[in-house]
């Protein structure tokens, strides 16, 4: 059984205020079964960015279709970047529990950063 | 507007409960950890506990086993269930709002705890 | 647990002048420092994270500085709404978050 890994490829992620900015995330493995979270930040105080089964993220999108049984993609969309959405991005895989979801294991991170806007 | 709002202080004796309460609104309450940080009178602030968006919970050791933390998000409020006070618990108890920094950027005006016989 | 002393505990400074404090943390903590206000009778106000990085609405005439383990907060020209006791707060060793004791600015 292939372990588990969470592949987020860009380390930075430099985007434009007003556009929207893609951070990608795909899995190697189905198992074990359990929701991807998307956060901002690490530590107690990381800030829920995504998250699939519940919450209001009116700026978030996926770019497949998470309820497909066999998805290997979590990459989300976030539109109308402004300088308050800089910092580090981790999907992270949770195992389903009972009664509570354990987290699992974290990507590495992509920083998104402001770029220099289009001359 | 950010707010946070805590009520439930007052006075109880040594060793009884109280349970205060934080309402939020003008943020995604789900979408934060929210924490308690407490101030006895006349001395500086002291982190008391957090609760993490996913529900972990963080206590510092002067509370450990006798204070409860817990959000209800349907609610957007936050919870601190209190037992077994000692004269050292009085303070004032404020909220707050932590960011992904893991700092507290939006608090609340507090609500005073008072235990004495 | 890291322990932040702050110093002076006290400091008398007329209005205009340049106030300087400092917080020095018993283990690094990196630039992982944020300072606080707080006025009487009020909650306390985040002014700087990061060691040196203005929360929102925060006026330029606050600044912070990092010298390894030893972190300044510098407010250029004090106004009156500047006289208040300031606390800095570890935000990279959690938990516990951890606050130093404080410094009172008071009017000279």
């Known amino acids: 059984e292939e372990e588990l890994q969470m592949i987020q490829p860009e380390k930075l992620l430099l985007v434009t205020v007003g556009k929207t900015a893609t951070l990608h995330c795909t899995v190697t493995s189905l198992l074990p079964v359990g929701p991807v979270l998307w956060f901002r930040g690490v530590g107690p105080g990381r800030e829920l960015i995504y998250n699939q089964k519940e919450g209001h993220f009116p700026r978030v999108t996926t770019v497949s279709d998470l309820t497909k049984r066999n998805n290997m993609d979590f990459s989300i969309r976030i539109s109308s970047i402004t300088p308050a959405d800089v910092g580090t991005y981790y999907c992270v895989k949770f195992r389903k529990g009972s009664p509570e979801n354990v987290e699992f294991k974290s990507g590495p991170g992509t920083e998104m950063a402001l770029g220099a806007k289009p001359s | 507007d950010v707010q946070l709002v805590e009520s439930g202080g007052g006075l109880v004796r040594p060793g009884e409960s109280l349970r205060l309460s934080c309402a939020a609104s003008?943020?995604?309450?789900?979408?934060?950890?929210v924490t308690w940080v407490r101030q006895a009178p006349g001395e500086g602030l002291e982190w008391v506990s957090l609760?993490?968006?996913?529900?972990?919970?963080y206590y510092a050791d002067s509370v450990k086993g006798r204070f409860t933390i817990s959000r209800d998000n349907s609610k957007s409020t936050l919870y601190l269930q209190m037992n077994g006070l000692r004269a050292e618990d009085t303070a004032v108890y404020y909220c707050?709002?932590?960011?992904?920094?893991?700092?507290?950027?939006?608090w609340g005006l507090g609500t005073l705890v008072t235990v004495s016989s | 647990e890291i322990v932040l002393t702050q110093s002076p505990g006290t400091l008398s400074v007329s209005p205009g002048e340049r106030a300087t404090f400092s917080c020095r943390a018993s283990?690094?903590?990196?630039?992982?420092l944020a300072w606080y206000q707080q006025k009487p009778g009020q909650a306390p106000r985040l002014l700087i994270y990061?060691?040196?990085t203005r929360a929102t609405g925060i006026p330029a005439r606050f600044s912070g500085s990092r010298s390894g383990t030893e972190f300044t907060l510098t407010i250029s020209s004090l106004q009156s709404e500047d006289f208040a006791v300031y606390y800095c707060?570890?935000?990279?060793?959690?938990?516990?978050?951890?606050f130093g004791g404080g410094t009172k600015v008071e009017i000279k």
């Open positions: 707050a709002k932590v960011t992904w920094k893991n700092v507290f950027d939006y």
């Open positions: 003008g943020f995604t309450f789900t979408n934060y950890a």
């Open positions: 609760i993490s968006v996913t529900g972990t919970t």
């Open positions: 283990q690094t903590v990196g630039s992982k």
């Open positions: 990061d060691a040196n």
């Open positions: 707060q570890q935000h990279t060793d959690w938990p516990p978050y951890t």
